[in-house]
């Protein structure tokens, strides 16, 4: 006995009232011609003619998935019984945005869950949300094709002064977080060492408070705070920063011993370990990866290794004793 054995019993599908033998007879030599697959789909078991009662399976091209019942059945009248089936995109296409906007990362297709960031030239901000996530086959929030860049009020206010300052006669004074920051400015993720907490803050407010000597505020990254590697690294770099000998202002941020301020983006970018200069008395004794041996590294090397998300355990500050 075999469960796969065919004793010629006609099948009844859940949604069928009749057995196939009860359907009107057509000449025995007839069948069904190849059906037309949905857009972006194809027939898996492709051939010229199909027997009555035979099923064909609809498959979708890479980047698409079937929605609906994916089998067509050949009927005795030579037609196909087919439910609603379509091939829906499982990836998002790179959005079409105005030329002034830069998309990062720049790819042709994005997988579900991947995000993009829209940025503007220096002195301008995105007039709307700057971060979008691929969900299903569309972007969330939806990307308006009229989205553009607008003059950054921060830049207008500051004149020849530094970020967080404004021109007052011939001198520069700190902006007031309450009075000068009522306009829209992009969101930043910020860490407060006093409360040991991170939160989303408008750039204007953050810079104004930092100018007013609020040293406990640390920039983590552009955009609202979202759990993930960027936030994790932002918090870790804040902890490491207290021992950094270099503190170089760079856009919203401050660059430390293991970083370089990118002139084109005004962002701190981690160096790679071989770019670290040997100098500096900020040393750490560490264990790398699954190694049992101890190693003495300088703060630059420690910062670059942690930034690259390589496994490293800091055993203690200072040289290894052995």
């Amino acid at each position: 006995f075999s469960i796969m054995e065919n004793n010629g019993q006609p099948c009844i599908n859940d949604d069928e009232e009749m057995k196939e033998v009860d359907l009107p007879e057509i000449e025995a030599d007839s069948g069904c011609p190849q059906p037309v697959p949905p857009e972006n789909g194809f027939i898996r078991n492709e051939k010229q003619l199909y027997l009555v009662g035979e099923d064909v399976e609809i498959s979708c091209l890479t980047g698409f998935e079937t929605v609906g019942y994916q089998y067509f059945r050949c009927l005795p009248d030579g037609t196909w019984r087919q439910g609603d089936v379509e091939c829906q995109r499982t990836e998002c296409i790179k959005p079409v945005v105005q030329e002034v906007l830069t998309i990062t990362p720049f790819q042709r297709l994005y997988r579900i869950g991947e995000s993009i960031e829209l940025t503007c030239p220096k002195g301008f901000v995105v007039a709307g949300p700057s971060r979008y996530t691929c969900q299903g086959n569309s972007w969330t929030p939806p990307i308006s094709n009229s989205l553009t860049c607008e003059k950054d009020t921060l830049t207008k206010l500051k004149g020849h002064c530094q970020l967080g300052q404004k021109q007052s006669g011939s001198e520069c004074i700190c902006m007031s977080p309450e009075e000068d920051c009522s306009h829209h400015s992009e969101d930043l993720c910020v860490f407060d060492t006093d409360s040991n907490d991170y939160f989303t803050s408008p750039a204007c407010k953050f810079l104004a408070e930092k100018c007013l000597n609020n040293q406990q505020l640390h920039f983590l990254h552009i955009g609202s705070c979202q759990d993930g590697r960027q936030l994790e690294w932002g918090l870790e770099r804040t902890r490491l920063s207290s021992n950094s000998t270099k503190k170089e202002s760079c856009g919203y941020d401050t660059c430390y011993d293991w970083e370089k301020c990118s002139a084109s983006t005004s962002k701190c970018v981690c160096l790679l370990p071989p770019q670290c200069f040997k100098g500096g008395n900020q040393l750490y004794c560490v264990k790398m990866g699954s190694s049992t041996s101890e190693k003495t590294l300088n703060i630059c090397e420690v910062g670059t290794i942690r930034c690259a998300n390589r496994k490293m355990e800091i055993l203690h500050p200072g040289k290894c004793l052995a």
Partner: antibody, heavy 118, light 112 residues
Framework: EVQLVESGGGLVQPGGSLKLSCAAS????????MAWVRQGPGKGLEWVAT????????YYRESVKGRFTISRDNAKNSLYLQMNSLRSEDTAVYYC???????????WGHGTLVTVSS | DVVMTQTPSTLSATPGQSASISCRSS???????????LYWYLQKPGQSPQLLIY???DLGSGVPNRFSGSGSGTDFTLKISRVEAEDVGIYYC?????????FGAGTRLELK
């Protein structure tokens, strides 16, 4: 001015050995990681190996692991590449390179030619 | 290993005109903290390579500002706004976002 001068290249038979040297000047040699990069005839560039300040950490591309050894002598301001079990595909101009905060390979020597042939 | 594909392999440019070279990586060079380690080098005839652009778009020390870099993710471009005779040579892109570091096969720039 940073100067890197390679030497030690030449013709060697497959399976043979060769030791390349790089003499560094114009900077404090012991303060920098150093690297070797090669360029096969009519081919692109290929990173070979990197060494840290004191030689306690070394890194190699997969195809040369176990055959090549990068080392340094900080007292002599010199970088070395000991190449054993040489193969024809190791034929290339070998460059000595130093990083900066801008790039991993910011300064390059003029190169020394290694030809592996029978 | 990450494969870096450069196009075109040869580029004929008219002095004073602009020229662009494309570099595409087999996987994204943007790491999980938002950094992209993409560099451009020029190797002039009979010389060793020299750094032009680092971190996608920053100009190397002493490099004329007619050179500029752009791009993100997997697609990058080097642009020369006004080609000069001294720009002749082979241009290489290089990535250091993933080990091992890898270079493109090069684009030869020649003058028309």
């Amino acid at each position: 001015e940073v100067q890197l001068v390679e030497s030690g290249g030449g013709l060697v038979q497959p399976g043979g050995s060769l030791k390349l040297s790089c003499a560094a000047s114009g900077f404090t040699f012991s303060d920098y990681y150093m690297a070797w990069v090669r360029q096969g005839p009519g081919k692109g560039l290929e990173w070979v190996a990197t060494i840290n300040y004191d030689g306690s950490s070394t890194y190699y591309r997969e195809s040369v692991k176990g055959r090549f050894t990068i080392s340094r002598d900080n007292a002599k301001n010199s970088l070395y590449l000991q190449m054993n079990s040489l193969r024809s595909e190791d034929t290339a101009v070998y460059y000595c390179a130093r990083p900066s905060t801008e790039a991993l390979f910011a300064y390059w020597g003029h190169g020394t030619l290694v030809t592996v042939s029978s | 290993d990450v494969v870096m594909t450069q196009t075109p392999s040869t580029l004929s440019a008219t002095p004073g005109q602009s020229a662009s070279i494309s570099c595409r990586s087999s996987q994204s060079l943007l790491n999980d903290v938002g950094n992209t380690y993409l560099y451009w080098y020029l190797q002039k005839p009979g010389q060793s390579p020299q750094l032009l652009i680092y971190l996608v778009s920053d100009l190397g020390s002493g490099v004329p500002n007619r050179f500029s870099g752009s791009g993100s993710g997997t697609d990058f471009t080097l642009k020369i706004s006004r080609v000069e005779a001294e720009d002749v040579g082979i241009y290489y892109c290089m990535q250091a976002s993933h080990a091992p570091y890898t270079f493109g096969a090069g684009t030869r720039l020649e003058l028309k």
